[in-house]
């Protein structure tokens, strides 16, 4: 058993049929010695008396808010949550496996630049009695500070018969050094509590590996005289790190016909313009990627050829 | 050329070669064998490699003030990785795949280090750790890790040379 926060405790249980469970001793936070009784949740049934209460925790019915009283007055509370371990593996019932970039990916994180600011998100089908708490650091043995905000519900989607909820959190490294080569990864830890179930999820990454620039901005076409060719131009996204002579992007320009089956013409360039042939009913799209490190491409910015 | 006394490197040549190194480091990565790295502990095998750190003067301001500190750091790293690529880790069994561009990567590391430090000038170089894995699977894992950290290292070096070529070239 360990303390998650003041008066909230997590009991770690091996979860299998007829498991013996864990013996837990609760102590009433009071100077009083006599006349103390214990109850669980809203029930008035007295579970025991005395300053300490010993219970055998085996299932969710044994978890909940234990309260010690004296003469009708509440002295203190202890909330017990369960953390299940099945076949040596901690349960992951609360969050949905996003399966990207690989199986057992519950947390996904992205950064728009090298400033040390990043966003993580996760999915669940649970709508009520759900709380999250997020902590982060750079490195684990001698951790350096990363400050995370509160997790918020950022999107709701209907997936088949059930709803899916997306939560996200923003974090900022306290003393970020955008130009340095990271040697210690960022660690993100999410505590999830659903009713009386506790789970924790972690992710470890370098900012450089989660970079995804915003799409190029101000995408424009300029027809070239007496030609089917057009000059496409664009600019770096506002959110990208500066100076651009240091934090450079590379771009992929694509000409795509209306039908997905039509041949795509693609050009790679480090410049912020390119000359392409504009076909009727086609569209021109541009996306960006860090020039020197193959992290994610941005989403496409597009304009119609006409 | 960046000589210990402090004249300027051939920024544009260094920029081109360092950008080439970035492509080679990425293209070599899947071709040194096959395994999922994520499951393996990262720090203990590659924490000996030189990193370009915050105080090394490789940020835009540091380069403007005095690029020599940064260039020396980059040179140390290039020599370090060049030695690793020539070591038993990459030459031993299991053999690199035939398609692997590790030979190009090796030559380019040496080429860039020579651009930074012509014959006859000597910056201190870092000791190469004795990473001599006994098992072929350990060697495979080390190759992956070395290439992953090389990708990060050359990305920073390429930014330095791109910025230098754009702002510090005479």
């Amino acid at each position: 058993i360990w303390e998650l926060k003041k008066d909230v405790y997590v009991v770690e249980l091996d979860w299998y049929p007829d498991a013996p469970g864990e013996m837990v001793v609760l102590t009433c936070d009071t100077p009083e010695e006599d006349g103390i009784t214990w109850t669980l949740d809203q029930s008035s049934e007295v579970l025991g008396s005395g300053k300490t209460l010993t219970i055998q925790v085996k299932e969710f019915g044994d978890a909940g808010q234990y309260t010690c009283h004296k003469g009708g007055e509440v002295l203190s509370h202890s909330l017990l949550l369960l953390h299940k371990k099945e076949d040596g593996i901690w349960s992951t019932d609360i969050l949905k496996d996003q399966k990207e970039p690989k199986n057992k990916t519950f947390l996904r994180c992205e950064a728009k630049n090298y400033s040390g600011r990043f966003t993580c998100w996760w999915l669940t089908t649970i709508s009520t009695d759900l709380t999250f708490s997020v902590k982060s650091s750079r490195g684990s043995s001698d951790p350096q500070g990363v400050t995370c905000g509160a997790a918020t519900l950022s999107a709701e989607r209907v997936r088949g018969d059930n709803k899916e909820y997306e939560y996200s959190v923003e974090c900022q490294e306290d003393s970020a050094c955008p130009a340095a080569e990271e040697s210690l990864p960022i660690e993100v830890m999410v505590d999830a509590v659903h009713k009386l179930k506790y789970e924790n999820y972690t992710s470890s990454f370098f900012i450089r590996d989660i970079i995804k620039p915003d799409p190029p901005k101000n995408l424009q076409l300029k027809p070239l005289k007496n030609s089917r060719q057009v000059e496409v131009s664009w600019e770096y996204p506002d959110t990208w790190s500066t100076p651009h002579s240091y934090f450079s992007l590379t771009f992929c320009v694509q000409v795509q016909g209306k039908s997905k089956r039509e041949k795509k013409d693609r050009v790679f360039t480090d410049k912020t313009s390119a000359t392409v042939i504009c076909r009727k009913n086609a569209s021109i799209s541009v996306r960006a990627q860090d020039r020197y490190y193959s992290s994610s491409w941005s989403e496409w910015a597009s304009v119609p050829c006409s | 050329r960046a000589v210990p006394g402090g004249s300027s490197p051939a920024w544009t040549q260094c920029q081109q070669l360092s950008q080439k190194l970035c492509t080679l480091a990425w293209s070599a990565h899947p071709l040194v064998g096959h395994m999922d790295l994520r499951e393996e502990g990262d720090e203990e095998t590659t924490n000996d490699v030189p990193h370009i750190q915050c105080g090394d003067g490789c940020d835009p301001q540091g380069l403007r003030d005095n690029s020599q500190f940064c260039l020396q750091r980059i040179h140390q790293g290039l020599i370090f990785y060049e030695k690793l690529l020539g070591s038993d880790i990459f030459t031993g069994e299991p053999s690199l795949l035939p398609d692997s561009p590790v030979g190009q990567l090796h030559a380019s590391l040496l080429g860039l280090s020579q651009l930074l430090q012509p014959e006859g000038h000597h910056w201190e170089t870092q000791q190469i750790p004795s990473l001599s894995p006994s098992q072929p699977w350990q060697r495979l894992l080390l190759r992956f890790k070395i290439l992953r950290s090389l990708q990060a290292f050359v990305a920073v070096a390429a930014r330095v040379f791109a910025h230098g070529a754009a702002t510090l070239s005479p």
Epitope: F268 | K20, T23, W26, S27, P98, D99, G103, Q104
Partner: antibody, heavy 116, light 107 residues
């Protein structure tokens, strides 16, 4: 299994251009360099250049610089080699080969004849 | 550019003979060397890469050795199907260059 299938033979006049294609299958196209090698009749092998499909980054033999362009179409896993301002000494069999080191997989070759 | 000097340029041998072809480079190329076999009208076939590693499907009578600047391809017991032209190629930095070839003919 890995296969590289090249376009058919071409006959060109001096000064013209030729574009040879090489369609790859059986592997992840963007992960491997594609190299072009040519062989003049009765002669040895000559490295022309290479391209990395994931980024479009290409390198060319110095003697061909300015006349050769290598491109890829990642949507169809096809590599192209275009040679411009053809001369009679460009008459050769042109091969594509997978990789940026030793070449374990080769196309069947495309004979380009330059003749007036 | 790295120069490749292959020798001999041709040789005559009989079935069962041990044949050795050498390749010398103008500078150190570590072990980044490949050997190919080519028959008339066909694409080259990779035999050896990284100086000594046998490519997939290549008979064990072929072997490669050497590092630095001096390399050798050995055919321990020449078979009828081995009469062909052999090329060495370095893959240490671009441009890659090939040796001028060694034609192995029937005595």
């Amino acid at each position: 299994q890995v296969q590289l299938v090249q376009s058919g033979a071409e006959v060109k006049k001096p000064g013209a251009s030729v574009k040879v294609s090489c369609k790859a299958s059986g592997y992840i196209f963007i992960t491997y360099w594609m190299t072009w090698v040519r062989q003049a009749p009765g002669q040895g092998l000559e490295w022309m250049g290479q391209i990395f499909p994931a980024s479009g980054s290409a390198d060319y033999a110095q003697k061909l610089q300015g006349r050769v362009t290598m491109t890829t179409d990642t949507s169809t896993s096809t590599a192209y080699m275009e040679l411009r301002s053809l001369r009679s000494d460009d008459t050769a069999v042109y091969y594509c080969a997978r990789g940026g080191g030793g070449f374990a997989y080769w196309g069947q070759g495309t004979l380009v004849t330059v003749s007036s | 550019d790295i120069q490749m000097t292959q020798s001999p340029s041709s040789l005559s041998a009989s079935v069962g003979d041990r044949v050795t072809i050498t390749c010398r480079t103008s500078e150190n190329i570590y072990s980044y060397l490949a050997w190919y076999q080519q028959k008339p009208g066909k694409a080259p076939k990779l035999l050896i890469y990284n100086a000594k590693t046998l490519a997939e499907g290549v008979p064990s009578r072929f072997s490669g050795s050497g590092s630095g600047t001096d390399f050798t391809l050995t055919i321990s017991s020449l078979q009828p199907e081995d009469f062909a032209t052999y090329y060495c190629q370095h893959h240490y930095g671009i441009p890659f260059t090939f040796g001028q070839g060694t034609k192995v003919e029937i005595k």
